[in-house]
């Protein structure tokens, strides 16, 4: 969470940003809020990126002004224009690229004053894991798959019954490059599993941490997955 203050004459406004992460190939949002101003025509929003000449995006008098927009962002940006008067200056970014990572500045000017705040935007790939029982294996095993990760993550297994156990000797993890030659598919197999136990497959890089849980009993298989972005907020 970054809060910036700006001074314009005697007036300053608070601008707040949140460190956020973009999933490459998908749409992303760079969060920025400011003190609301009921006069839309008096609000100017500028997004800038460190090391880039020109603007990422500019919104003023209720409309986008893309005359100074850098070409790498052409056709890829928007604000939530409906929500600007209530203080939402967040930037929407289409088809996030690795090269979109960096330090951004959200600059706001309203009839109340002006202010800005920086935001660190990380880019990578992250996806939910899915765990299935691998009946083809000679012994009962679990297969944890997640389709898109970058940078290469670490994978660890845990179990409810054998808490603290090291499963690296009884698991095998592989990373397969996807067709776009950036992201990778993660596959990890855990061998010699026992029924009536809950196993967790944890995949983590510096952007996100994902966990898939599976509980196998004689009568049913229960699954649960969750994904958490790291260092956000």
């Amino acid at each position: 969470l970054i809060i910036g203050f700006g001074i314009s004459g005697k007036h300053f406004i608070t601008v707040t940003t949140f460190t956020s992460a973009g999933n490459i190939g998908e749409d992303g949002t760079l969060s920025c809020t400011f003190e609301p101003d009921i006069k839309l025509n008096g609000i100017v929003i500028q997004w800038l990126k460190e090391g880039i000449k020109g603007l990422v995006h500019e919104f003023k008098e209720g409309k986008d002004d893309l005359s100074q927009q850098h070409e790498m962002f052409r056709g890829r940006t928007a604000v939530f224009a409906d929500q600007v008067v209530v203080g939402n200056a967040s930037l929407r970014l289409k088809n996030v690229q690795l090269t979109d990572a960096g330090t951004y500045t959200c600059y706001i000017r309203t009839s109340k004053g002006k202010g800005n705040a920086n935001l660190e935007y990380k880019t990578g790939a992250f996806s939910m894991p899915e765990i299935n029982v691998d009946y083809n294996a000679s012994s009962e095993s679990l297969r944890c798959e997640a389709p898109r990760w970058f940078p290469q993550p670490t994978v660890a297994w845990a179990s409810q019954v054998d808490q603290g156990a090291n499963f690296s000797e009884v698991s095998n993890t592989s990373f397969e490059l996807n067709s776009e030659n950036v992201t990778m598919k993660v596959v990890s197999v855990l061998y010699n599993v026992t029924i009536n136990n809950t196993y967790s497959c944890m995949i983590e890089n510096d952007i996100a941490k994902a966990t898939g849980d599976i509980k196998v009993t004689d009568s049913e298989v229960k699954r649960r997955s969750q994904l958490q972005l790291l260092n956000s907020g």
Epitope: D27, K63, D82
Partner: antibody, heavy 115, light 107 residues
Framework: QVQLVQSGAEVKKPGASVKVSCKAS????????MHWVRQAPGQRLEWMGY????????SYNQKFKGRVTITVDTSSSTAYMELSSLRSEDTAVYYC????????WGQGTLVTVSS | DIQMTQSPSSLSASVGDRVTITCKAS??????LSWYQQKPGKAPKTLIY???SLADGVPSRFSGSGSGTDFTLTISSLQPEDFATYYC?????????FGGGTKVEIK
Amino acid sequence: QVQLVQSGAEVKKPGASVKVSCKASGYTFTSYYMHWVRQAPGQRLEWMGYVDPFNGGTSYNQKFKGRVTITVDTSSSTAYMELSSLRSEDTAVYYCAFIAGFANWGQGTLVTVSS
Amino acid sequence: DIQMTQSPSSLSASVGDRVTITCKASQDIKSYLSWYQQKPGKAPKTLIYYATSLADGVPSRFSGSGSGTDFTLTISSLQPEDFATYYCLQHGESPYTFGGGTKVEIK
């Protein structure tokens, strides 16, 4: 200036579908949600749903129980509203509209459902 | 669904009068309320959104106030072109719902 221009009046038979278009100009199409509202003769306005042109996301009034589909073509800055399984009570003027930002609505498209 | 109760349903006023129209939501909608003007045979026009923000190109004699459940549209000095029907809309919760309208007529 900002303009929303809708397609012309339609006469349809019960059970048919109608697709109304709304061409936007004068602003960046992907910045504002596009809403669809209808007004039956002598009735209050009724919200049907909206589309987020940035990503095609939609929200619908469940009253229409899957009969309404709102889409966009960003290359032509056009929004579409399709209403299927038409009945006589769907006879109304259909509008594309902004809830925030700009005053303008589309001029309206009269859809008459009659056997 | 959230019910929007608009009052009065009609009123008579003279040019130059200050006119107030109210809208009451059946539950808290924060500031998610818009006001619209419609003239006979014409498309509605957005006047106010988020309870207090004036839409682009709308004269400053129109203003909105309120939050939560009670909202007001005020026309500070009624002009001949303001005789029309006015609607409120809550956009805090789907489905968005309109009030029944207030017809402003010439006295």
